[in-house]
């Protein structure tokens, strides 16, 4: 089978600071030197791109400076962190992996990680 499979956790709870981390792992059918990782958010059948990065195998994963994502790569595993999340950002976050080079191209799409974000309660006013 030439398909590429992508695994990611089913559920992740964001921290009180609005940070969520999860691992995206792919089973590569070929020996890629250039890989693109994209995080997509699916809500109400609408799909939007959250962030994307292309990296050379063995090198670090670099997102754009203004990206809400950071990540590290190790072999066929990518550790992704999404920051600045609020309750309204709760949704299904899909990891998409593409083996860009050398040919042939392969596409892998995970089943998605449901990220739950709970906005922290505001601190009560203190008398002290």
């Amino acid at each position: 089978c030439k398909a590429m499979h992508v695994a990611q956790p089913a559920v992740v709870l964001a921290s009180s600071r609005g940070i969520a981390s999860f691992v995206c792992e792919y089973a590569s059918p070929g020996k890629a030197t250039e890989v693109r990782v994209t995080v997509l958010r699916q809500a109400d059948s609408q799909v939007t791109e959250v962030c994307a990065a292309t990296y050379m195998m063995g090198n670090e994963l670099t997102f754009l400076d203004d990206s809400i994502c950071t990540g590290t790569s190790s072999g066929n595993q990518v550790n992704l962190t999404i920051q600045g999340l609020r309750a309204m950002d709760t949704g299904l976050y899909i990891c998409k992996v593409e083996l860009m080079y050398p040919p042939p191209y392969y596409l892998g799409i995970g089943n998605g990680t449901q990220i739950y974000v709970i906005d922290p309660e505001p601190c009560p006013d203190s008398d002290f």
Epitope: C1, K2, A3, M4, H5, P29, E34, R36, T38, L40, V47, T48, E49, A52, T54, I94, K96, E98, M100, Y101, P103, P104, Y105, Y106, L107, G108, I109
Partner: antibody, heavy 118, light 108 residues
């Protein structure tokens, strides 16, 4: 809304060249793969080429490899297909299409007809 | 390359009937990477289904996709007059991307 408009088709002699354009609007060009697909008269769909994201990675069908070149200009939101050494069997309607974020070609242009004939 | 074989070549049915179209791959295709398109004469194709079973935006629920491995099916539960067209399957999991030769659904 998303729109793709092809241009540049016409009648050309075998061995000559032609450049097709596809102007995109309504989305960020660099976030998507962009493809050319062709359809010979009365026949089915044939994938021709794709260009991804920053434009460094391009792939072609064997039938056009070495003769056709796909390129894009993100500042103009325009996709191109440079077709050289044209043959009679290249006669087709050429469509540009956007690769959907989860796969499949989710938007298509109206197509432009290329006729290769002496 | 992955070869997709569609059957039947032509399907003659009446409005209101159920249409079942088949697409068979020469090697296993992950269900995440199979799409179905509809094309009417003189028009560009339109994406119906991606990921073997997910309906594209604006596609009515009478269209459904299923299957895995090498065998995939597009089902139209009750044919409407506007559904008579040619349908293509496509795999996009690996290059070169390939289409089936199409199934024409015409009015009996």
């Amino acid at each position: 809304q998303v729109q793709l408009v092809e241009s540049g088709g016409g009648v050309v002699q075998p061995g000559r060249s032609l450049r097709l354009s596809c102007t995109a609007s309504g989305f960020t060009f660099s976030s998507y793969g962009m493809d050319w697909v062709r359809q010979a008269p009365g026949k089915g769909l044939e994938w021709v080429a794709v260009i991804w994201y920053d434009g460094r990675n391009k792939y072609y069908a064997d039938s056009v490899k070495g003769r056709f070149t796909i390129s894009g200009d993100s500042s103009k939101n325009t996709l191109y297909l440079q077709m050289n050494s044209l043959r009679a069997e290249d006669t087709a309607v050429y469509y540009c299409a956007r690769g959907g974020l989860l796969g499949g070609f989710d938007y298509w242009g109206q197509g432009t007809l290329v006729t290769v004939s002496s | 390359e992955i070869v997709l074989t569609q059957s039947p070549g032509t399907l003659s049915l009446s409005p209101g009937e159920r249409a079942t179209l088949s697409c068979r791959a020469s090697q296993s295709v992950s269900s995440s990477y199979l799409a179905w398109y509809q094309q009417k004469p003189g028009q560009a194709p339109r994406l119906l289904i991606y990921g073997a079973s997910s309906r594209a935006t604006g596609i009515p629920d009478r269209f459904s996709g299923s299957g895995s491995g090498t065998d995939f099916t597009l089902t139209i539960s009750r044919l409407e007059p506007e559904d008579f067209a040619v349908y293509y399957c496509q795999q996009y999991g690996t290059s070169p991307f390939t289409f089936g030769h199409g199934t024409k659904v015409d009015i009996k």
